[in-house]
Interface confidence: low
Amino acid sequence: ATCYCRTGRCATRESLSGVCEISGRLYRLCCR
């Protein structure tokens, strides 16, 4: 599956590590 980090209103960022993490905090991840 390809996973994406959701940022802002419409940007999608592919997450290669399979997590969306900033400074140890996890954020919304969408995998499809």
């Epitope: 390809t2 980090c5 940022t7 802002g8 209103r9 419409c10 940007a11 999608t12 960022r13 592919e14 997450s15 290669l16 590590s17 997590v19 969306c20 993490e21 900033i22 905090r25 954020y27």
Partner: antibody, heavy 119, light 111 residues
Framework: QVQLQQSGAELARPGASVKLSCKAS????????ISWVKQRTGQGLEWIGE????????YYNEKFKGKATLTADKSSSTAYMQLSSLTSEDSAVYFC????????????WGQGTTLTVSS | DIVLTQSPASLAVSLGQRATISCRAS??????????MHWYQQKPGQPPKLLIY???NLESGIPARFSGSGSRTDFTLTINPVEADDVATYYC?????????FGGGTKLEIK
């Protein structure tokens, strides 16, 4: 150490196509994205798009859709950008840059490739 | 697209003094309590170099003379004290929304 080595300067005719390369070393190529950025002489920076070498997935700035095509070869750790239907507006320095994972900024840059489009 | 407006376009500062560069976004670049604004330094004939990421985080190897602050739409890069090696053009860049965009640049010179 992380390095992005770009191909040499190019001179191309209007209407032609050109393929620029960016060879990565010093890190796992498939663990980061690669973006391409355009800079016209004496001007600012424009994000063209990015490719994730592991999946081959690409994301483009709408402005450059149909102009730029991004590809990557995992076996040689090299990213490519093909520019088509060249005009004088495409004359610029093109940089490749490594994308930080997930919430990206550009943490390492190639030295740039100068493209001159002239008849 | 999010438009980033930098000011001033050029700046002359005496050695040892403080340089302040502003970047204003046409809409908020904040998400999840973080600001997705970054700063780069570019010297003639060289690629840009990352200085500050997510508004206020100093990139590894960058001197502590460089600092960043701000949130939502208003951001500042401060260099204090300015050294001769800081002569360059400075760009802000947002990654909160596609397409990623850059400011027009601020050229720093020594007075």
């Amino acid at each position: 150490q992380v390095q992005l080595q770009q191909s040499g300067a190019e001179l191309a005719r209007p209407g032609a196509s050109v393929k620029l390369s960016c060879k990565a070393s010093g890190y796992t190529f498939t663990s980061y994205g690669i973006s391409w950025v355009k800079q016209r002489t004496g001007q600012g920076l424009e994000w063209i798009g990015e490719i994730y070498p592991r999946s081959g997935n690409t994301y483009y700035n709408e402005k450059f859709k149909g102009k730029a095509t991004l590809t990557a070869d995992k076996s040689s750790s090299t990213a490519y950008m093909q520019l088509s239907s060249l005009t004088s507006e495409d004359s610029a320095v093109y940089f490749c840059a490594r994308d930080y994972d997930g919430f990206p900024y550009f943490d390492y840059w190639g030295q740039g490739t100068t493209l001159t489009v002239s008849s | 697209d999010i438009v980033l407006t930098q000011s001033p376009a050029s700046l002359a500062v005496s050695l040892g003094q403080r340089a302040t560069i502003s970047c204003r976004a046409s809409e908020s670049v904040d998400s999840y309590g973080y600001s997705f604004m970054h700063w780069y330094q570019q010297k003639p004939g060289q690629p840009p170099k990352l200085l500050i990421y997510r508004a206020s985080n100093l990139e590894s190897g960058i001197p502590a003379r460089f600092s960043g602050s701000g949130s939502r739409t208003d951001f500042t890069l401060t260099i204090n004290p300015v050294e001769a090696d800081d002569v360059a053009t400075y760009y802000c860049q947002q990654s909160n929304e596609d397409p990623r965009t850059f400011g027009g640049g601020t050229k720093l010179e020594i007075k």
